[in-house]
């Protein structure tokens, strides 16, 4: 190889070892029979050299640096050439560096030809290996503006006082043009301006200078976004840190066309604007930092540009002014995205403050709109607290657990509506009475309705899940000892049509000691499957539950247990089951940790099944599944 650099070229070539590899044999640059691992060629020099190995690209890299001085003479503006031409260089990973020094009063603009640039962050890389690294200067300090790949939206970067631009090309890349030009501009009076041009739907992730390290103190950086008029843009902050300010406040400023309050000033922790039509600017302004403990300011954000959806032009009113202790959250449902560009899905408050989720609280009327390609990507979760603080006032009081009709007017699916029912400890208990009798969901007889009620204890220290219940069964009521949460969970969009089947009344009743009592009136046509709470995890220690099973006069009930033995092993206490005839009060007691469960048995009258747990050994829990069937009486055995 021969590299000759003209004396006035201001170009220096450096060949040096790249990243250490585990290659068995090293490689050297050979210059007139001398071996070296570094070669520097300066302007006016001509050097002949070879490599001592067949694949020098596995060992060496080449840096070509051109210093451009705009301080002492005219600046060579226009398209930047790759010099020396890549065809004259050895096939090594190459980095072309242009170091432009200019006066503070002169703005320098880097213009990138199509495909434009895409900024990438720490730990990422470019698919084709072609990387642009751009730095600026503040006095003597170098500031990293960012590293970029091809195929993005960044079309121009304006700086002042100088630019250091590095273009990295892998050894196998055929590229022979720089892909950018330099122009002079008037002073920009800030660190830099990055222009990002969208021609259609898409997204861009951008970062503050020096990211992930700190943005320079008291500096200003601006991003200009060029957006087609028919599209909408939304900004979301992916990651940010605030420094410790002594004077002034760190902030972002938006210049939004048509806004009457330009510039709109936001804190970094605020929700950022969305649903913006047309071009806009975003500026990051630093502050004077505390000299002793400066901290760091940094920002990584995303701009998402997409078509406005039909729904985004509608305003929905959510009236929670008459509700108490209620919160409504609209959020993304958890799904794996496979498409490359996924349009954003935002819910907007007052059409401007858009975010991926939104929580509305009771006591106010809220106006919301959507900026989303497909509203099935969102769902709604509602929480409502119903509490009783004075047991004398609440006793026998009833509340309807019904989803308010207002919610059905919203274009997103309801996922969960949770009622937290809170009672004074050891004073009152609760009874749930459904509009339609309920079926307990079991593997043997799963619910196939569009919604279910999930009933669980709402006492933080207690892990007790009574089960999942849907309309169309035999459970007439569920009594629970203390605080519970009842969650109406929907499973299909058809819930809107089936909404009339929902309806549960909760009443506050005198306190009782059992954890739960289920009142069951079996249907003559089908088996009723019942199982102990906390199925698969075991009934909690020392917990007692009962089933009050009604047997009509003309029927006989058959009680069948799924297993021969419960498998429970008690560490302390005893686990037992009592089956009691309600008419005669005759009862049988079974030791669940010792005895076999009873064989199928017939009951001619209503009866109780009561199960009380011990403190089981780990892994040897108490789980019981049983069923009841009715058959007509053939002979009167009273």
């Amino acid at each position: 190889f021969e590299i000759a650099l003209p004396r006035e070229s201001n170009i220096t070539v450096l060949i040096k070892l790249g990243t250490p590899t585990l290659l068995a044999k090293p490689c050297y640059i050979v210059i007139s029979k001398r071996h070296t691992t570094m070669l520097s060629i300066k302007p006016g020099e001509r050097i002949l050299f070879t490599f001592s190995c067949q694949s020098p690209e596995n060992h060496f890299v080449i840096e070509i640096q051109k210093n451009i001085d705009c301080m002492s003479g005219p600046c060579p503006f226009g398209e930047v050439q790759l010099q020396p031409s890549t065809s004259l260089l050895p096939t090594l990973n190459r980095t072309f560096i242009w170091d432009v020094k200019a006066h503070k009063s002169i703005g320098l603009e880097l213009q990138f030809s199509i495909p434009r640039l895409r900024q990438f962050g720490p730990g990422e890389s470019c698919p084709d290996g072609v990387t642009y690294s751009i730095s600026g200067r503040i006095d003597a300090t170098v500031v990293r503006i960012g590293t970029f790949c091809s195929n993005g939206t960044v079309s121009r970067i304006k700086m002042q006082e100088g630019v250091k631009m590095a273009l990295h090309l892998p050894w196998f890349h055929p590229r022979n043009v720089s892909g950018f030009s330099i122009a002079n501009r008037s002073s920009i009076k800030r660190l830099c301006i990055i222009e990002s041009v969208f021609e259609g739907e898409g997204s861009a992730t951008l970062m503050s200078a020096n990211y992930p390290e700190g943005f320079p103190e008291d500096e200003l950086m601006t991003w200009q976004f060029v957006i087609p008029a028919h599209l909408r843009a939304s900004v979301s902050f992916l990651n940010f840190n605030l420094s410790n300010c002594e004077r002034k406040e760190e902030r972002v400023e938006y210049y939004i066309p048509g806004s009457t309050t330009n510039p709109e000033v936001f804190k970094l922790e605020d929700k950022q604007p969305g649903n913006m039509a047309g071009n806009f600017n975003l500026s990051l302004q630093g502050c004077d930092q505390d000299a002793q403990n400066p901290g760091i300011l940094r920002l990584q954000f995303q701009v998402l540009v997409q078509h406005p959806q039909n729904e985004s032009n509608k305003i929905y009113v959510v009236d929670l002014s008459n509700e108490r202790a209620t919160s409504l959250t609209i959020e993304p449902r958890p799904v794996k995205q496979s498409r490359k560009f996924v349009p954003g899905c935002f819910v907007c408050l007052e059409s401007r403050t858009c975010s991926t989720n939104l929580t509305l609280t009771s006591g106010s009327k809220h106006k919301i709109s959507f900026l989303c390609d497909n509203l099935t990507r969102l769902w709604m979760n509602v929480e409502k607290n119903i509490s009783c603080t004075d047991h004398r006032y609440c006793q026998r009081k009833s509340y309807s657990l019904q989803v308010p009709s207002d919610i059905f007017h919203l274009p997103v699916e309801l996922h969960d509506f949770s009622w937290k029912l809170l009672v004074p400890k050891d004073r009152l208990s609760l009874v749930l009475v459904p509009a339609q009798k309920l079926q307990q969901h079991t593997h043997e007889k799963p619910c196939n309705t569009s919604f279910s009620y999930l009933v669980a204890s709402a006492i933080p220290s207690q892990d007790l899940y009574f089960g999942s219940f849907c309309p169309g069964g035999s459970i007439e009521q569920i009594q629970v000892k203390q605080n519970i949460s009842v969650t109406l969970r929907t499973f299909a969009p058809s819930f809107r049509q089936e909404a009339s089947r929902q309806g549960l009344t909760v009443s506050f009743i005198p306190y009782f000691k059992e954890e739960g009592v289920f009142t069951v009136t079996p249907d003559t046509k089908s088996k009723v499957y019942l199982r102990t709470p906390n199925w698969d995890r075991g009934l909690p220690s020392l917990t007692s539950v009962s089933w009050n099973i009604s047997v009509p006069r003309d029927q006989v009930a058959c009680l069948t247990f799924f297993k021969e033995r419960t498998g429970v092993v008690c560490q302390t206490g005893r686990a037992f089951m009592i089956i009691q005839e309600q008419r005669t009060r005759a009862e049988e007691i079974f030791s669940l940790d010792e005895d076999a469960l009873p064989k199928p048995r017939f009951h001619h009258h209503s009866f109780w099944v009561n199960i009380s747990n011990c403190s089981p050994a780990s892994g040897k829990q108490l789980d019981l599944l049983f069923w009841v069937t009715l058959t007509p009486r053939t002979v009167d055995l009273t």
Epitope: L14, K25, R34, M38
Partner: antibody, heavy 116, light 108 residues
Framework: EVQLVESGGGLVQPGGSLRLSCAAS????????MHWVRQAPGKGLEWVAS????????SYADSVKGRFTISADTSKNTAYLQMNSLRAEDTAVYYC?????????WGQGTLVTVSS | DIQMTQSPSSLSASVGDRVTITCRAS??????VAWYQQKPGKAPKLLIY???SLYSGVPSRFSGSRSGTDFTLTISSLQPEDFATYYC??????????FGQGTKVEIK
């Protein structure tokens, strides 16, 4: 695994001689440059000499030129430093190092004490 | 011979501090500068080669840079295991190798 083990250090009188050895394993010294670097007690590092076995090229610090000789036996994968006319100021820990990505592997060092 | 003038000769710093050590070459050595870390009683360890390339296995808090004949080693956030002596060295192929005088980084 690359390893360098120095030996041959010890106590010697001024004007005496010593031969230090550096046994390399995990790589072939034929392909690399081998270096000796020393460190006097409580002082900084001082490069002493280097050899490139593939070309036979040697280089010395001015302070040892004419008194020290660096050599290598590629069949034994070992580098040597022959030290003659030793002086009190040659007292130091002598390290052997491999040269490629600068001095990328070092031995644990051997102590040479020149004293009467 | 080329002189490598290293400064400061010692410095006190706390865990988490950003530490900068500089070396000035008496003439151009291109980017042929390395930085080493040495702990008492141990052999030096290579941190940086070719002025700014991080040697494999070295934590990314260490970085090197060059501006003409001035070379800088930066530790972005000092860790307890970083208290040691640091040396710069030029290894430009036309000249004998030379080290800087060393910088001792001590706990404040």
């Amino acid at each position: 695994e690359v390893q360098l083990v120095e030996s041959g250090g010890g106590l010697v009188q001024p004007g005496g001689s010593l031969r230090l050895s550096c046994a390399a394993s995990g790589f072939n010294i034929s392909y690399y440059s081998m270096h000796w670097v020393r460190q006097a007690p409580g002082k900084g590092l001082e490069w002493v000499a280097s050899i490139s076995p593939y070309s036979g090229y040697t280089s010395y610090a001015d302070s040892v030129k004419g008194r020290f000789t660096i050599s290598a036996d590629t069949s034994k994968n070992t580098a040597y430093l022959q030290m003659n006319s030793l002086r009190a100021e040659d007292t130091a820990v002598y390290y052997c190092a491999r040269g490629y990505y600068a001095l990328d592997y070092w031995g644990q060092g051997t102590l040479v004490t020149v004293s009467s | 011979d080329i002189q490598m003038t290293q400064s400061p000769s010692s410095l006190s710093a706390s865990v988490g501090d950003r530490v900068t050590i500089t070396c000035r070459a008496s003439q151009s050595v291109s980017s042929a500068v390395a930085w080493y870390q040495q702990k008492p009683g141990k052999a030096p360890k290579l941190l940086i080669y070719s002025a700014s390339s991080l040697y494999s296995g070295v934590p990314s808090r260490f970085s090197g840079s060059r501006s003409g004949t001035d070379f800088t080693l930066t530790i972005s956030s000092l860790q307890p295991e970083d208290f040691a002596t640091y040396y710069c060295q030029q290894y430009y192929y036309f000249y004998p190798f030379t080290f800087g005088q060393g910088t001792k980084v001590e706990i404040k």
